[in-house]
């Protein structure tokens, strides 16, 4: 099935330069039990919550969020209203954390690209894509290299020399990602609760992040659980105005209820440990 991923895309609205929209999506097999959108950094690590979306209970949002909504079963959008004259959103990092069952919590961050033209951002695509400008450069380079190679090939054939093997010009998204962001790896450990996982919190190296508060106050039984298989995050997606990282989170951190069990079976948010293994504390 592959490792779950989260994509984040930030767009400036063409009609209103003070309006921004954050789009986030989850690529994975599990059921989403909660989405938290924050700005200024990841939730619980310096970020400030803008919205919380539960697939059945509803949505809660706080200024400057204007409207948070589900776009599909696995993606959300958050419209932001910037009342100030100078736009603070332009240089702000927005993060989306998806709590899913049974995978755990996965968080990614993104910001508006510096050179973004209003309204020109492509819609979020749930497949790995390269940034449009990079793709253009790479495409042109490829065509030129191919052309040069073909000319060399013809010239050398005329001279009756064996055709040299050309090194293909290809740059995959992993190579591109490595230039900008640290590759992510998340490890898991099982709690007594079969639906809970402990995470080593990963965030891109470009963000000043730390483990959420309360790591040390996990219930003692978590310390002597067998180590689960290490989960290596699959290649992040690069999209215009976005980057993706993944974090396999403590289901207790992700907080929220497995979808078909009702609120009472939800585990605990913010890495502070399960509430008697049925925690669920006031989200809005």
């Amino acid at each position: 099935a592959g490792t779950p991923e989260v994509w984040v895309q930030v767009q400036m609205e063409a009609t209103e330069l003070s309006s921004f929209t954050v789009h986030c999506g989850f690529l994975g097999p599990g059921s989403i039990s909660l989405v938290t959108v924050s700005w200024g950094g990841p939730d619980g690590a310096g970020g400030t919550k803008l919205a919380v979306l539960h697939p059945e209970l509803g949505t809660r949002q706080w200024a400057p969020a204007r409207q948070a909504r589900w776009e599909t079963q696995s993606s959300i959008s958050l419209a932001l209203e910037d009342s100030g004259a100078s736009s603070p959103f332009a240089n702000t990092t927005f993060c989306c954390k998806f709590a899913s069952f049974p995978e755990g919590s996965w968080e990614s961050c993104g910001s508006l690209p510096p050179s973004s033209d209003p309204g020109l951002s492509a819609p979020p695509t749930p497949v790995p894509i390269l940034r449009a400008d990079l793709a253009g450069i790479l495409g042109l380079s490829g065509v030129l290299l191919f052309g040069c190679g073909y000319l060399l090939h013809l010239l050398r054939r005329q001279k009756h020399r064996p055709t040299p093997r050309l090194q293909p010009s290809h740059t995959n998204s992993q190579a591109l990602t490595a230039q900008a962001w640290a590759p992510s790896q998340a490890s898991q450990a099982a709690l007594h609760d079969p639906y809970a996982t402990i995470n080593t919190s990963f965030c891109p190296a470009t963000l000043d992040t730390a483990h959420p508060n309360g790591w040390a106050s996990l219930p003692t039984h978590a310390a002597h659980q067998p180590q689960g298989p290490a989960a290596s995050a699959s290649t992040p997606i690069l999209a215009r105005g976005s980057f993706v990282s993944v974090e396999n989170g403590l289901y207790t951190q992700a907080g929220e209820r497995p979808p078909h069990t009702g609120p009472g079976l939800t585990l605990f948010p913010d890495c502070r440990g399960p509430r008697a293994l049925e925690g669920r504390f006031g989200v809005r």
Epitope: L57, T72, G214
Partner: antibody, heavy 114, light 113 residues
Framework: EVQLVQSGAEVKKPGSSVKVSCKAS????????IEWVRQAPGQGLEWIGE????????NYNEKFKGRVTFTADTSTNTAYMELSSLRSEDTAVYYC???????WGQGTLVTVSS | DIVMTQSPDSLAVSLGERATINCKSS????????????LAWYQQKPGQPPKLLIY???TRESGVPDRFSGSGSGTDFTLTISSLQAEDVAVYYC?????????FGQGTKLEIK
């Protein structure tokens, strides 16, 4: 088990203010909103607003804007609702709640009478 | 604001019989993106705070007996108690969980006939 425990009943004069507290235990206080809902005697439920304790972000019902203030103290896991310029029609049971109204405090009866 | 209207205002049903409460919203509570209806039902007994019974129009809260069920979509919703028990005597409220501000129905008082 998450519990929300509210302060005791209050009797207030018209024009005065009342401050109701809601202490949370058994959960991560700063992660989720505390909602405030009131219920006048024999009447239905009316949402007053909410506060997100971690950031003190708030949303208010337009009807109460300017008269109600929400605060939260994360060191004591306590949220507060202060309602000013009280009038007789503010006589009601005031509830705090959380997680999309899944958890509720026991309620605080505020009586406004001259 | 979304206006929630319940019917009937009061209802008397014999023990073991079916009780049905209706709720109508002034705007659709269906989110077209994920096809979920954002409506909740609460039970309130005298002197107690409300208790969440149903959310997402049809999902029972943990610990709620399966005689309680919710149905409906868009603007019309129903709470059904398949076999009324004495402890079900209460006031029932529906609530818009779709958009701000959260709004409640006026309540339906359920009694035993």
């Amino acid at each position: 088990e998450v519990q929300l425990v509210q302060s005791g009943a209050e009797v207030k004069k018209p024009g005065s203010s009342v401050k109701v507290s809601c202490k949370a235990s058994g959960g991560t206080f700063s992660s989720f909103s505390i909602e405030w809902v009131r219920q006048a005697p024999g009447q239905g439920l009316e949402w007053i607003g909410e506060i997100l304790p971690g950031s003190n972000s708030t949303n208010y019902n337009e009807k109460f804007k300017g008269r109600v203030t929400f605060t939260a103290d994360t060191s004591t896991n306590t949220a507060y609702m202060e309602l000013s310029s009280l009038r007789s029609e503010d006589t009601a049971v005031y509830y705090c709640s959380s997680y999309w109204f899944a958890y509720w405090g026991q309620g605080t009866l505020v009586t406004v009478s001259s | 604001d979304i206006v929630m209207t319940q019917s009937p205002d009061s209802l008397a049903v014999s023990l073991g019989e079916r009780a049905t409460i209706n709720c109508k919203s002034s705007q659709s509570l269906l989110n077209s993106g994920n096809q979920k209806n954002y409506l909740a039902w609460y039970q309130q007994k005298p002197g107690q705070p409300p208790k969440l019974l149903i959310y997402g129009a049809s999902t029972r809260e943990s610990g709620v007996p399966d005689r309680f069920s919710g149905s409906g979509s868009g603007t019309d919703f129903t709470l059904t108690i398949s076999s009324l028990q004495a402890e079900d005597v209460a006031v029932y409220y529906c609530q818009n969980a779709h958009s701000y501000p959260p709004t409640f129905g006026q309540g339906t008082k359920l009694e035993i006939k």
